[in-house]
């Protein structure tokens, strides 16, 4: 699987999850999030050669098409597969609120 | 929606579904598919600016991050959202077989 366990331990050029730390205030301008200050959102990148963690039949077909037609602009793209939530603390006026934001952390990638 | 109805009728630079005809024999080397000769598989391409058909909270966050940090390599990617099957005819020996291949035709795209 193209997950953090594999990708963070290997120098992988092809589609893999990459570490990306996002600071809410500095990187997004989100002053309203009080905790955490930031988090590892991670991201997916790298080429998707034929059959690499193909998401659907279409991505398999497109991967093969791209292999046999290397000049073509059509090719699968490396995108998130498994995502995890992040719990944040913010204030509505003087009232603290805790919310679980879904799909905030990329744990693995796929070629789609 | 970034679907064929919209994308095929507009000159859209950003993420959209694009027409792509694939000939099974010529483009894939699949001689075993007898019918159809080929089909419109289509594909997704184009930049994913902030909030454009964002698939998850992560893609929204990543889009904003990319907007505020344009030098960053991390950005959402335009990939298939809705796919449709394709029915094909092939032979096993002298016996004709009809099979519906799932997720073969891209009908719409999203930023993931």
């Amino acid at each position: 699987a193209l997950d953090t366990n594999y990708c963070f331990r290997n120098l992988e050029e092809n589609c893999c999850v990459r570490p990306l730390y996002i600071d809410f205030r500095q990187d997004l301008g989100w002053k309203w999030v009080h905790e955490p200050k930031g988090y590892y959102a991670n991201f997916c990148s790298g080429p998707c050669p034929y059959l690499r963690s193909a998401d659907t039949t279409h991505s398999t077909v497109l991967g093969l098409y791209n292999t046999l037609n290397p000049e073509a602009s059509a090719s699968p793209c490396c995108v998130p597969q498994d995502l995890e939530p992040l719990t944040i603390l913010y204030y509505v006026g003087r009232t603290p609120k805790v919310e679980q934001l879904s799909n905030m952390v990329v744990k693995s990638c796929k070629c789609s | 929606a970034l679907d064929t109805n919209y994308c095929f009728r507009n000159l859209e630079e950003n993420c959209c579904v694009r027409p792509l005809y694939i000939d099974f024999r010529q483009d894939l080397g699949w001689k075993w598919v007898h019918e159809p000769k080929g089909y419109y598989a289509n594909f997704c391409s184009g930049p994913c600016p902030y909030l454009r058909s964002a698939d998850t909270t992560h893609s929204t966050v990543l889009g904003l991050y990319n907007t505020l940090n344009p030098e960053a390599s991390a950005s959402p990617c335009c990939v298939p959202q809705d796919l449709e099957p394709l029915t094909i005819l092939y032979y096993v020996g002298r016996t004709p077989k009809v099979e519906q291949l799932s997720n073969m035709v891209v009908k719409s795209c999203k930023c993931s």
């Epitope: 002053k31 905790e35 719990t87 603390l89 204030y91 509505v92 006026g93 603290p96 805790v98 | -």
Partner: antibody, heavy 119, light 111 residues
Framework: EVQLLESGGGLVQPGGSLRLSCAAS????????MSWVRQAPGKGLELVAD??????????YYSDSVKDRFTISRDDSKSTVYLQMNSLRAEDTAVYYC??????????WGQGTLVTVSS | DIQLTQSPSSLSASVGDRVTITCRAS??????????MHWYQQKPGKQPKLLIY???NLASGIPSRFSGSGSGTDFTLTISSLQPEDFATYYC?????????FGGGTKVEIK
């Protein structure tokens, strides 16, 4: 650098009025709630009045000890928060601090202004 | 309103001593994994200064000899090795609900 400069304190007779001002600089004033915290001589800290940002409709809070006598307000265009104090009593004698609380804690404090209520 | 009780109300210690101050809330001031308790230092004639926010986070410019811990109703401020400039009064404050309240203070004096 965040700065909070209080003014308007002084000696006033019981039943009198005073208006405290706090001029803020060095941060996005419009985004944050502002508070007045007082400290009577030799005593602890008491939050007396609080006003949140426009985002939350300038909602105010007052401690029971000053309710109906004190009014907190803010002028975002001047980055200033005010405390109008009426019907002052001897027990209102204290140093009044202007503070900013971006998220639960009072991160920055002014130097304080002394209010003395005495005849 | 949530009441905060600090103990001791005063203590005498020497330079180099490890000092622990506790703050007990009348009800929990934690929400999920977030602990909404904060600590301040005040020296005579000066305004209070934020030391620790959300139970364990060191405020900007505060020396690492200060630390905070706790959750729910019981919280602790620790000075690992007391310095001459640390003799002051320390206050806890919660932000679990409105109104936010302060503890009565703990005065740290020179023995």
């Amino acid at each position: 650098e965040v700065q909070l400069l209080e003014s308007g304190g002084g000696l006033v007779q019981p039943g009198g009025s005073l208006r405290l001002s706090c001029a803020a600089s060095g941060f996005d004033f419009n985004s944050y709630g502002m508070s007045w915290v007082r400290q009577a001589p030799g005593k602890g800290l008491e939050l007396v009045a609080d006003i949140v940002s426009k985002t939350y409709n300038y909602t105010t809070y007052y401690s029971d000890s000053v309710k109906d006598r004190f009014t907190i307000s803010r002028d975002d265009s001047k980055s200033t928060v005010y405390l109008q104090m009426n019907s002052l009593r001897a027990e209102d004698t204290a140093v009044y601090y202007c503070t900013v609380a971006p998220g639960g804690s009072f991160d920055y404090w002014g130097q304080g202004t002394l209010v003395t209520v005495s005849s | 309103d949530i009441q905060l009780t600090q103990s001791p109300s005063s203590l005498s210690a020497s330079v180099g001593d490890r000092v622990t101050i506790t703050c007990r809330a009348s009800q929990s001031v934690s929400i999920s994994r977030f602990n909404l308790m904060h600590w301040y230092q005040q020296k005579p004639g000066k305004q209070p200064k934020l030391l620790i926010y959300r139970a364990s986070n060191l405020a900007s410019g505060i020396p690492s000899r200060f630390s905070g811990s706790g959750s729910g109703t019981d919280f602790t401020l620790t000075i690992s090795s007391l310095q001459p400039e640390d003799f002051a009064t320390y206050y806890c404050q919660h932000s679990r609900e409105s109104p936010w309240t302060f503890g009565g203070g703990t005065k740290v004096e020179i023995k």
